[in-house]
């Protein structure tokens, strides 16, 4: 005859307030005849948690059907967990006896402790934008978790980052803890569409980590490159000059044309296009009237991007006498 063993596989069970806790207990033998009861604590003052046969235990249900003939699973579920439920739970086998049943064997116990889930991580980027090749800092914060052990990882576009510092507070015992981590990220010119992710893993999350994200588009400024060109074709008395502003971010941009130092107020045609990497291109066309009196026209395209100092490009217009006379199309 096999000796009865009471198996409680979990030494520690972490549960969150309001949830249901499952306490496992299996037996290795049906003998001796008698009930299995659940208690919290030990000694004469121990608290009866569940007795299948009598008593009132509205928060407790059994995992399997205890009335099945050869049932060996005496696991229970306790609903609506509160802080008052913490403690060590024992499943205890009794042998039928007279006048009282006699305690025969106890399981090793499962300690139920309160776990609290971390809050959703909040990721904050720098207050001001920075240009590529520079380093920016992102912070990630999550609060209210217990126990203290927690894992935090940083990713940029799915690639794990290594340059970060993490602190968990407080250092001593507490009912709940907070984590704060700062990651240093080197910006690349193509980072407009990039994301940084802060990932928090905790025992209460059951393998499903929480993530907070920040878009690098909020942190990066890609300054434009300028090119001013004169179109080879001429329409009547007018020459078309193009200012191409390439690869900038964010979209905020002011463009002004100057003729020989004088700012031109007249309307100009322009188009804005978005590149695959999230940066923008802006093309502005400026029509210059050509007359005999205008031999030396210097055009300036000035761009003020995202509140930064203006940058400009100049073009000395090339108009040949032949072009003036013939009104024919010309290549400068």
């Amino acid at each position: 005859e096999e000796e009865l063993q009471m198996i409680q596989p979990e030494k520690l069970l972490l549960v969150t307030v309001g949830k249901t806790a499952t306490l496992h207990c299996t037996v290795t033998s049906l003998l001796p005849v008698g009930p299995v009861l659940w208690f919290r604590g030990v000694g004469p003052g121990r608290e009866l948690i569940y007795n299948q046969k009598e008593g009132h235990f509205p928060r407790v249900t059994t995992v399997s059907d205890l009335t099945k003939r050869n049932n060996m699973d005496f696991s229970i579920r306790i609903s609506s967990i509160t802080p008052a439920d913490v403690g060590t739970y024992y499943c205890v086998k009794f042998r039928k006896g007279s006048p009282e049943n006699v305690e025969f064997k106890s399981g090793p116990g499962t300690e139920m402790a309160l776990g609290a889930k971390p809050s959703a991580p909040v990721v904050l980027g720098p207050a001001a934008r920075t240009t590529p090749e520079h380093t920016v800092s992102f912070t990630c914060e999550s609060h209210g978790f217990s126990p203290r052990d927690i894992t935090l990882k940083w990713f940029k576009n799915g690639n794990e980052l290594s340059d970060f510092q993490t602190n968990v507070d407080p250092t001593g015992q507490s009912v709940a803890y907070s984590i704060r981590s700062t990651a240093r990220v080197v910006l690349d010119p193509w980072d407009v569409r990039s994301q940084v992710i802060c990932e928090v893993a905790h025992v209460t999350l059951q393998g499903d980590p929480l993530r907070g994200t920040a878009n690098l588009s909020e942190a990066i400024r890609v300054p434009p490159t300028l090119e001013v060109t004169q179109q080879p074709m001429r329409v009547g008395n007018q020459v078309n000059v193009t200012c191409q502003v390439r690869k900038f971010y964010p979209q905020s941009l002011q463009l002004t044309w100057s003729e020989n130092g004088n700012v031109c107020q007249r309307e100009t045609a322009s188009t804005l296009t978005e590149n695959k990497d999230g940066t923008y291109n802006w093309t502005s066309w400026f029509l210059v009237n050509i007359s005999d009196q205008r031999d030396d026209v210097v055009l300036t395209c000035q761009v003020k991007h995202d509140g930064q100092l203006a940058v400009s490009k100049r073009l000395a217009l090339e108009v040949t006498v032949h072009q003036k006379d013939q009104s024919s199309d010309a290549t400068p």
């Epitope: 004469p44 003052g45 608290e47 299948q52 046969k53 009598e54 008593g55 009132h56 009335t67």
Partner: antibody
């Protein structure tokens, strides 16, 4: 829904035997202890005993030991309480209850010559 | 056998007043095994408080239970007319199970 329905009132002569039934529904009688409690007119509650219908194991209060027999029929989901050698002081309402939580409506037994 | 002694036998109070019912055990009773029942005339007892301090389903929050060892208490913070009844404490810590003799809560 858990229900415990007891048999009707009984009038018995001293020395006779009474057998009260308690038919349950909403649960399997084998799963719980079935208790019996006495309440004499104007008096308090007194525990008589209980049965584990799964294996017919019984426990009785010393006061009733020898005169009371509690049985259960698992096929009909019914518990029984039989009290013999009735005397006038056995005049009372008898309750069955399931595991101390749910009670039957009571059965009045009057012992009178 | 564990003898349960309830006091007072009768408690006369008015609605709105606070009621304190005591139950004293002749030997120690684990709090898990101390129940209270309410009974009204012509009705079966109803489970009112289980495991010393837990209110059975549907029992108003003005009721509370406390105690340990040999001394247990049922308290009603502010009496309502429907609270007037007989209350019994009950132990099922050891055989034979026993009840207190009851406290009758009556309207003053």
């Amino acid at each position: 829904e858990v229900q415990l329905v007891q048999s009707g009132a009984e009038v018995k002569k001293p020395g006779a035997t009474v057998k009260i039934s308690c038919k349950v529904s909403g649960f399997n009688i084998k799963d719980y202890y079935m208790h019996w409690v006495q309440q004499a007119p104007g008096k308090g509650l007194e525990w008589i005993g209980r049965i584990d219908p799964e294996d017919a194991e019984t426990k009785y209060a010393p006061k009733f030991q020898g005169r009371v027999t509690i049985t259960a029929d698992t096929s009909t989901n019914t518990a029984y309480m039989e009290l013999s050698s009735l005397r006038s002081e056995d005049t009372a309402v008898y309750y069955c209850d399931r595991g101390l939580a749910y009670w039957g409506q009571g059965t009045l037994v009057t012992v009178s010559s | 056998e564990i003898v349960l002694t309830q006091s007072p036998a009768t408690l006369s109070l008015s609605p709105g007043e606070r009621a304190t019912l005591s139950c004293s055990a002749s030997s120690s009773v684990s709090s898990s095994y101390l129940y209270w029942y309410q009974q009204k005339p012509g009705q079966a007892p109803k489970l009112w408080i289980y495991s010393t301090s837990n209110l059975a389903s549907g029992i108003p929050a003005r009721f509370s239970g406390s105690g340990s060892g040999t001394d247990f208490t049922l308290t009603i913070s502010s009496l309502e007319p429907e609270d007037f009844a007989v209350y019994y404490c009950h132990q099922w810590s050891s055989y034979p199970y026993t009840f207190g003799q009851g406290t009758k809560l009556e309207i003053k």
